[in-house]
């Protein structure tokens, strides 16, 4: 059965300077391949976080993603700024062989509203 990516919150509001959690769960880790978070859609979308070992300032995973059966790919964004406003998508990829990874499923998106302090 096809993997499903769930982002339960349609939107979240956070005060500038605070932190917020963006929730994402998947129903399967197969086919093998990374899960990444993006802001925006299309060609201009911005990679926000990838669960592939790299360091991303201000962002960290919420659950222990080193568990081999982990299905929770939620992230915490710290010290939120107005520039962080936008819609965030949790995306499951299938690893490519000699080509780039292939996007196979995206969550419905979570809109982040940043409120003035």
């Amino acid at each position: 059965t096809e993997v499903k990516v769930t982002q339960p919150e349609k939107s979240v509001s956070v005060a500038a300077g605070d932190s917020t959690i963006l929730n994402c769960t998947v129903t399967s880790l197969l086919p093998v391949g990374p899960i990444r978070w993006y802001r925006g859609v299309g060609q201009s979308r911005l990679l926000i976080y990838s669960f592939t070992g790299e360091h991303f300032p201000r962002i960290r995973n919420v659950s222990d993603t080193t568990k081999r059966n982990n299905m929770d790919f939620s992230i915490r964004i710290s010290n939120v700024t107005p520039e962080d406003a936008g819609t965030y998508y949790c995306v499951k990829f299938q690893r490519g062989s000699s080509e780039p990874d292939t996007e196979i499923q995206s969550g419905g998106g979570t809109e982040v509203y940043v409120l003035a302090k």
């Epitope: 086919p31 093998v32 990374p34 222990d64 080193t66 081999r68």
Partner: antibody
Framework: DVQLVESGGGVVRPGESLRLSCAAS????????MSWVRQAPGKGLEWLAG????????YYIDSVKGRFTISRDNPKNSLYLQMSSLTAEDTAVYYC???????????WGLGTLVTVSS | SYELTQPPSVSVSPGQTARITCSGG??????YAWYQQKPGQAPVTVIH???KRPSDIPERFSGSSSGTTVTLTISGVQAEDEADYYC???????????FGGGTKLTVL
């Protein structure tokens, strides 16, 4: 620099127990899953067990389930392998290895030799 | 569970290209890596995540995959590359790691 140093190997008799340790340095130990791999003399590599970064989840190859226990102490940057009911077939060099995000291995210790002999 | 199959030995002249294959995994659920081991030494990771090379590994080492077969390619082989090479796999279906039997690379 990432460093993994195993200790605790030695000569034991069949049926006895042994506890191996792996001291980690040069990286944030509590952020990485870890594994134990062994290599019998003149043979290939055999994965034995893995443990999640937080230590709550463990995984074993069927042949050592119930006999070997993997654990970790994150404040001490240490990984352990408790082995019991040892047999001659457990004679090998035991390596600890750091896992990548997808549970392959990127760094290995130098190994510690366990000899089970009467 | 699955088995990874490698040729027992591969021979190549210095400067030539060596290719070591590994088959038997399920591409849908398995990630692959390659580990180099010289006599009396610990393994060293030369490729992980199918084709990712650690920063301290020479560029002549590369990994690729096609279907259920993965390949370690060593371009411009040097005498120091003589070693045993193990294919390793992680199966996301069973949560188990597996190694191939190893391939002895001889530089003629």
């Amino acid at each position: 620099d990432v460093q993994l140093v195993e200790s605790g190997g030695g000569v034991v008799r069949p049926g006895e127990s042994l506890r191996l340790s792996c001291a980690a340095s040069g990286f944030t130990f509590s952020s990485y899953a870890m594994s134990w791999v062994r290599q019998a003399p003149g043979k290939g590599l055999e994965w034995l067990a893995g443990i999640s970064a937080g230590g709550s989840d463990t995984y074993y190859i069927d042949s050592v389930k119930g006999r070997f226990t993997i654990s970790r102490d994150n404040p001490k940057n240490s990984l352990y392998l408790q082995m019991s009911s040892l047999t001659a077939e457990d004679t090998a060099v035991y390596y600890c290895a750091r896992e990548t995000w997808n549970h392959l291995f990127d760094y290995w210790g130098l190994g510690t030799l366990v000899t089970v002999s009467s | 569970s699955y088995e990874l199959t490698q040729p027992p030995s591969v021979s190549v002249s210095p400067g030539q290209t060596a290719r070591i294959t590994c088959s038997g995994g399920d591409y849908y659920s398995t990630y692959y890596a390659w580990y180099q081991q010289k006599p009396g030494q610990a393994p060293v990771t030369v490729i992980h995540s199918d084709d990712k090379r650690p920063s301290d590994i020479p560029e002549r080492f590369s990994g690729s995959s096609s279907g259920t077969t993965v390949t370690l390619t060593i371009s411009g082989v040097q005498a120091e590359d003589e070693a045993d090479y193990y294919c390793g796999g992680y199966d996301g279906r069973t949560y188990i790691n597996t190694f191939g039997g190893g391939t002895k690379l001889t530089v003629l």
